[in-house]
Amino acid sequence: TQHGIRLPLRSGLGGAPLGLRLPRETDEEPEEPGRRGSFVEMVDNLRGKSGQGYYVEMTVGSPPQTLNILVDTGSSNFAVGAAPHPFLHRYYQRQLSSTYRDLRKGVYVPYTQGKWEGELGTDLVSIPHGPNVTVRANIAAITESDKFFINGSNWEGILGLAYAEIARPDDSLEPFFDSLVKQTHVPNLFSLQLCGAGFPLNQSEVLASVGGSMIIGGIDHSLYTGSLWYTPIRREWYYEVIIVRVEINGQDLKMDCKEYNYDKSIVDSGTTNLRLPKKVFEAAVKSIKAASSTEKFPDGFWLGEQLVCWQAGTTPWNIFPVISLYLMGEVTNQSFRITILPQQYLRPVEDVATSQDDCYKFAISQSSTGTVMGAVIMEGFYVVFDRARKRIGFAVSACHVHDEFRTAAVEGPFVTLDMEDCGYNIPQTDESTLMT
């Protein structure tokens, strides 16, 4: 994926077995053919937390080799460590798989900082806490990398869930989810519930923690409250959407809405922060600073570098504003808004002060590649990637962190005119030069 500070996200998680929750009581009215309302076997199949990424257990090859794989809606390659590396506890051993097929083709993926490269092949892949299917999928076997795998993390690969257009080396390499849908009866849809902890977890707590759910092929009604609101996928490459208005504590930023989507706006589970274009970031921070002016914080905090600590349990959530993003709706001239709390955009950080303190980093940052709705946004919501109907749904997550005074929200409809004008059209010549 193209963002310099984006991937990989530190996982730092141990390998305790995934625990399935007891089945929930749900209203199981089907939304569409093949979409039941409860997917008990997939609930809680993710581990991780904001700032460290979320991973799912997958198996590759015959006999199956189990690996933890980072779930990334901001890229489109299924790539796994396939050679010894000091930071990997395990890796994909192609020579031990009777079903591995070499594609005799290499792949090289540079990032602004770091890179990975490897060899393309196919093999049988399944998701133990997913649909009961096995698919033959393209796999990039990572043989060399720099600043990709991270010491102390517990994942060995990445599952790019976006579209073929941004796959490497080119769009002819079918992404995993496309292969899954083609080869099985799994509906062309998945949904993510990422559950931020809201407080720093030490290693032993993380081992016992639950990160969230990736529901493959459907929607689980127990994972959200209220209604799902859908925004069109503008173009099938990244999961690109259009933001039409931004408010801080109900105050409109009053910018030309094109600025919000310059040069695009995407939903990306592989990014920690809410990343905003430079002008938008500056306006948003100015507004957040003004709203929280009873306390002052150093510039390094607003840059996402310094941590601010409060006595445990005394974080002044009330002085920080809510942030609302208005998204283009499915109906002409109609939008809806998603609202996040400081509990989402102040990211808890562990091991820096004493146990008597709660410390946080500001998790909104500047971007030169458009708006990125990363984990900071996604942890407030249950997000439905409805590829079949080219739309993304948002509902308030049943696991989002809030307080007794405020909660994340998804609300609508609102009348918004000329929303199509909010989209930025990337010049064709620029697209191929984007630094990955």
Epitope: T294, E295, K296, F297, P298, D299, G300, F301, E305, Q306, L307, V308, C309, D351, V352, A353, C359
Partner: antibody
Framework: QLQLQESGPGLVKPSETLSLTCTVS??????????WGWIRQPPGKGLEWIGN???????YYNPSLRGRVTISVDTSKNQFSLKLSSVTAADTAVYYC????????????WGRGTLVTVSS | EIVLTQSPATLSLSPGERATLSCRAS??????LAWFQQKPGQAPRLLIY???NRATGIPARFSGSGSGTDFTLTISSLEPEDFAVYYC??????????FGGGTKVEIK
Amino acid sequence: QLQLQESGPGLVKPSETLSLTCTVSGGPISSSSYYWGWIRQPPGKGLEWIGNIYYSGSTYYNPSLRGRVTISVDTSKNQFSLKLSSVTAADTAVYYCARLGHGYNYFDLWGRGTLVTVSS
Amino acid sequence: EIVLTQSPATLSLSPGERATLSCRASQSVSSYLAWFQQKPGQAPRLLIYDASNRATGIPARFSGSGSGTDFTLTISSLEPEDFAVYYCQQVYVWPPRTFGGGTKVEIK
């Protein structure tokens, strides 16, 4: 130019409350550019941060002293104060007041310090 | 908790010599580190902030370097008034709370 001056009793009995005041002269304590803080230094030892205050009254304290320490501000008198309760001999130190500048990050201006001895 | 370890505890040098003081953080503090000078009976004085920026009025013979966990204060040529105790302080975790134990620069 801006100056800071600590004042208060030099001797406090064990179990009593230590009270010090820092008077800011040459500029307003209500400047939005600064926090104000207290640091102490036991004889022959290193520096220990006690806490900070913003003119609005927002405070931050050293976890090791929480429950005993209170810092307050009086903008009308251009002063901020330190109270440390239930003192023991271990609280004997030179107490400094200081300005937290450079974007609220660094103690860039200090008072001369005042020695407080805890003894009966 | 981030711990700052200064070394050496004492540095014995002659005027005109170069002094190199070290401050090591138990985990990365980026460039959010300051150096202070304290002479006997006086309050500390800010020398360096953000690891390498000289505070107002500080002579050019004082310089700071480093980032992450390892930092250095260098006095290129010691003047008689430079013999003092030097402290580092991290402000990566805010509010600034952690000082190093100090390095005493004494006349040889």
